[in-house]
C-alpha cells in the first residue's frame, strides 16, 4: 500500500481467483483514543472500533472511503483504491491501446518544435467517475523539471456503437535547450482513477522523436507564362523553431488528381518553392519534416490547381 | 578549415558533408526507431557517447560568439563514432553486407573530421569505451543504439554547419 495523495491510498493486489489479498491497517488521524468507530462509504454499518482498523482487501467491495467517527462527528477519511496485477502485469483497463507506433501504446505525444513544449493524449471509452493526473521529468535518476497542466477532455468521437473520449495535456520543459542533443529522455507518467480502480501509464521519449511540424503556411501558386507549370511557394509554419537557418525543414510537394487512384507526382526540396505541372482538377499539397532528423512529416497544406 | 587556433572552417563543404551524414545515418538503419531495444540483460550501453550539450556553444548565439568550442565538440564526436563504426561492434557478426551504408557512413565521418582538423593539428579526443559484446545479438543491439545516437548527433552537427554556412561564411 502507498499514498497517492493526502488521504488517498493505493493497494496493490495480485488478481487471481481466491487470492489472499492484502492486509491493510488504517489509522484514524485524531488525538482521540476512545469511542472511535469505522464505516465504509455511505453505509452506517460499523466495521470496527478503535483508533486503528485492520482489513483484508481482496476485491473492489473492500475498497472505498473509510471514515472514522466519534459521537456522530467525522474525524478523518482514508480512500482506498485498488491497483490490479494479473499474471505479473499491471492492468490497463482504463485507457485504450492506440497500437501506433506499436502495440501497448496508451499515451501518444507530439511536439511542434524544439522549445521543450509537447502535448500528450490518450483515449478511453469511460465517460464518468474518471480522473487523471500527469507528471513529467527529463530523466529518471536525477530528474530535471517538466511542468504539465491539467488533463482536459479534448475530443469525443463515435466509433461504431461506442463513444470514445480523447484527453490531452500540455507540458513544458522548465529549462529547455533547443539546440542541444538530448541524452536523457522525457518521462511522462499518467495516474488514472476510475471509480475505485487505479492504473498508471508511462511514456518515455526524446523530443526529437516526437517532432511533428505544423503544415507549411501561405501556400500559393503562381502560373508561369506560356506553360502548364506553376511555381508553388510556401513559408515555414509560425510554430517552428527559429532561426530557420539552424532549425531547417525539408518539404515534399505533391500533385494529386481528383481520383485517389491517379498517379501522384512528388518532389522533395529544401527550398520554400518548387515548379510543378498543374493538371486540371488536381490539387497541390506540401508538407514539412525536420531536414536533418527523420521524425514525423507534418499534415499536408493544400491548394486547388484551378 | 577549422584549426585549433581559431580560423574558420569550410562551412559550405562541412554543411554538404554533414547533410550527407544525416542521410547515411538514417539509411544505415531506417527501422531502428521501430525496434524494441529494451532487451533483457541489456545494460545502458550507449551512455558514454559524446553528446552536444547545452554549454557546448553549438546554439546560434554560441556559434556567433565563438564557434571553436562547438567545432571541437563536433570533431570529438566524429572521431568517437568513426572509431566505433570501425570496431568489432560493426565488423563482427552478424556481418554487414559490403554495400551497407555503414561503410560510407564510416568514411564520411572520417572525411568530415579531417575537414575540421587538417593533418598536424590536434584537438584532444575522447577515449573510446571498450565495448566488446560477448554475444552476437548484443553486438546487433549495440549497433542499433549507436546508430540511433549517431542520428541525433549528426542532426545537431548538420544544423550547426547549415547555420554557419548561411550566417558565418566569409
Amino acid at each position: 500500500i502507498w499514498e497517492l495523495k493526502k488521504d488517498v491510498y493505493v493497494v496493490e493486489l495480485d488478481w487471481y481467483p481466491d487470492a489472499p489479498g492484502e492486509m491493510v491497517v488504517l489509522t484514524c488521524d485524531t488525538p482521540e483514543e476512545d469511542g472511535i468507530t469505522w464505516t465504509l462509504d455511505q453505509s452506517s454499518e460499523v466495521l470496527g472500533s478503535g483508533k486503528t482498523l485492520t482489513i483484508q482487501v481482496k476485491e473492489f467491495g473492500d475498497a472505498g472511503q473509510y471514515t472514522c467517527h466519534k459521537g456522530g462527528e467525522v474525524l478523518s477519511h482514508s480512500l482506498l483504491l485498488l491497483h490490479k496485477k494479473e499474471d505479473g502485469i499491471w492492468s490497463t483497463d482504463i485507457l485504450k491501446d492506440q497500437k501506433e507506433p506499436k502495440n501497448k501504446t496508451f499515451l501518444r505525444c507530439e511536439a511542434k518544435n524544439y522549445s521543450g513544449r509537447f502535448t500528450c493524449w490518450w483515449l478511453t471509452t469511460i465517460s464518468t467517475d474518471l480522473t487523471f493526473s500527469v507528471k513529467s521529468s527529463r530523466g529518471s535518476s536525477d530528474p530535471q523539471g517538466v511542468t504539465c497542466g491539467a488533463a482536459t477532455l479534448s475530443a469525443e468521437r463515435v466509433r461504431g456503437d461506442n463513444k470514445e473520449y480523447e484527453y490531452s495535456v500540455e507540458c513544458q520543459e522548465d529549462s529547455a535547450c533547443p539546440a542541444a542533443e538530448e541524452s536523457l529522455p522525457i518521462e511522462v507518467m499518467v495516474d488514472a482513477v476510475h471509480k475505485l480502480k487505479y492504473e498508471n501509464y508511462t511514456s518515455s521519449f526524446f523530443i526529437r522523436d516526437i517532432i511533428k511540424p505544423d503544415p507549411p503556411k501561405n501556400l500559393q501558386l503562381k502560373p508561369l507564362k506560356n506553360s502548364r507549370q506553376v511555381e508553388v511557394s510556401w513559408e515555414y509554419p509560425d510554430t517552428w523553431s527559429t532561426p530557420h537557418s539552424y532549425f531547417s525543414l525539408t518539404f515534399c510537394v505533391q500533385v494529386q488528381g481528383k481520383s485517389k487512384r491517379e498517379k501522384k507526382d512528388r518532389v522533395f526540396t529544401d527550398k520554400t518553392s518548387a515548379t510543378v505541372i498543374c493538371r486540371k482538377n488536381a490539387s497541390i499539397s506540401v508538407r514539412a519534416q525536420d531536414r536533418y532528423y527523420s521524425s514525423s512529416w507534418s499534415e499536408w497544406a493544400s491548394v486547388p490547381c484551378s | 578549415r577549422a584549426v585549433p587556433g581559431g580560423s574558420s572552417p569550410a562551412w559550405t563543404q562541412c554543411q554538404q558533408l554533414s547533410q550527407k551524414l544525416c542521410t547515411l545515418a538514417w539509411s544505415a538503419h531506417p527501422l531502428v526507431g521501430h525496434m524494441d531495444l529494451r532487451e533483457e540483460g541489456d545494460e545502458e550501453t550507449t551512455n558514454d557517447v559524446p553528446h552536444i550539450q547545452c554549454g557546448d556553444g553549438c546554439d546560434p548565439q554560441g556559434l556567433r560568439d565563438n564557434s571553436q568550442f562547438c567545432l571541437q565538440r563536433i570533431h570529438q564526436g566524429l572521431i568517437f563514432y568513426e572509431k566505433l563504426l570501425g570496431s568489432d561492434i560493426f565488423t563482427g557478426e552478424p556481418s554487414l553486407l559490403p554495400d551497407s551504408p555503414v561503410g560510407q557512413l564510416h568514411a564520411s565521418l572520417l572525411g568530415l573530421s579531417q575537414l575540421l582538423q587538417p593533418e598536424g593539428h590536434h584537438w584532444e579526443t575522447q577515449q573510446i569505451p571498450s565495448l566488446s559484446p560477448s554475444q552476437p545479438w548484443q553486438r546487433l543491439l549495440l549497433r542499433f543504439k549507436i546508430l540511433r545516437s549517431l542520428q541525433a548527433f549528426v542532426a545537431v552537427a548538420a544544423r550547426v554547419f547549415a547555420h554557419g554556412a548561411a550566417t558565418l561564411s566569409p
Epitope: - | 531495444l37 565488423t91 552476437p136
Partner: antibody
Framework: QVQLVQSGAEVKKPGSSVKVSCKAS????????ITWVRQAPGQGLEWMGE????????YYNEKFKGRVTITADKSTSTAYMELSSLRSEDTAVYYC???????????????????WGQGTLVTVSS | DIVMTQSPDSLAVSLGERATINCKAS???????????LHWYQQKPGQPPKLIYN??KLESGVPDRFSGSGSGTDFTLTISSLQAEDVAVYYC?????????FGGGTKVEIK
C-alpha cells in the same frame, strides 16, 4: 557450385588429438563463416563453434573447455577443427558447414548453415 | 546455456496429414521483440542436416507445406500435408546466444 569436402575417417587413441579439415570451393571463402557440428552415433546434433575469416572472430562452445581449436587458412580456403585430449565419448561424425550470418535492413539477424560437408567419422578407442 | 527442448521425440503421421513439432527454449530467443533467432533443420538418414526454416523465413526451394511459427520461448514447425520424402529427424537450433544449441530432435515417420 558450393562444395565442402572434409578429410577422411580417423581412429584415435584416448588422450590424443585429431585435426579435421574442410576444403571449401565454389564461393568466396572469406565472405562466410565455417561452423563445426558433431553427432555421436544415434544421437542429436551438437554445435562446437565457428570461425569467420573476414572478421577473424571465433566462437566456441565452452563445453569443450579449450579442447577445441577452430582455424581457417584463407590462402587455401580450408577450415580446420582440432580436438585434443580425446575420450571415448568424442566418437562422432564431425560436420563442417558454411555459415552465413548477416544483418540487413530486412533481415537484421539472418543465420544459415546452408551447405554442409559430408562428415568425418572420428572413432576414439583404445 | 539456452536449453532447447523438442516434443514429441517421435511422431507417426499418415500421408497427407498434418505433423506438428514443438520446440521450447529455456530463455527468450527472439531479439527486439520480433526478430527470431530460431531455425529448423531436417536430417535424413546418412545425410548431413539441411536448413528448412530460417528465423521466420522458409528457405528457398523448401516446399510451402512447411511453416514455422512462434516467438519468445515457444516455437512450432508444421508440415501441413506429410509426404513420403518428409520422413526425417527435425532439429531446432537457437543462435541468439553462444553456445548455439540444438533441440534433441523429433523423428517423423509415416503411420
Amino acid at each position: 557450385q558450393v562444395q565442402l569436402v572434409q578429410s577422411g575417417a580417423e581412429v584415435k587413441k584416448p588422450g590424443s588429438s585429431v585435426k579435421v579439415s574442410c576444403k571449401a570451393s565454389g564461393y568466396t571463402f572469406a565472405s562466410y563463416g565455417i561452423t563445426w557440428v558433431r553427432q555421436a552415433p544415434g544421437q542429436g546434433l551438437e554445435w562446437m563453434g565457428e570461425n569467420y575469416p573476414r572478421s577473424g572472430n571465433t566462437y566456441y562452445n565452452e563445453k569443450f573447455k579449450g579442447r577445441v581449436t577452430i582455424t581457417a587458412d584463407k590462402s587455401t580456403s580450408t577450415a580446420y577443427m582440432e580436438l585434443s585430449s580425446l575420450r571415448s565419448e568424442d566418437t562422432a561424425v564431425y560436420y563442417c558447414a558454411r555459415a552465413e550470418f548477416i544483418s540487413t535492413v530486412v533481415a537484421p539477424y539472418y543465420y544459415a548453415l546452408d551447405y554442409w560437408g559430408q562428415g568425418t567419422l572420428v572413432t576414439v578407442s583404445s | 546455456d539456452i536449453v532447447m527442448t523438442q516434443s514429441p521425440d517421435s511422431l507417426a503421421v499418415s500421408l497427407g496429414e498434418r505433423a506438428t513439432i514443438n520446440c521450447k527454449a529455456s530463455k527468450k530467443v527472439t531479439i527486439f521483440g520480433s526478430t527470431s533467432a530460431l531455425h529448423w533443420y531436417q536430417q535424413k538418414p546418412g545425410q548431413p542436416p539441411k536448413l528448412i526454416y530460417n528465423g521466420a523465413k522458409l528457405e528457398s526451394g523448401v516446399p510451402d507445406r512447411f511453416s514455422g511459427s512462434g516467438s519468445g520461448t515457444d516455437f512450432t514447425l508444421t508440415i501441413s500435408s506429410l509426404q513420403a520424402e518428409d520422413v526425417a529427424v527435425y532439429y531446432c537450433l537457437q543462435n541468439k546466444e553462444v553456445p548455439y544449441t540444438f533441440g534433441g530432435g523429433t523423428k517423423v515417420e509415416i503411420k
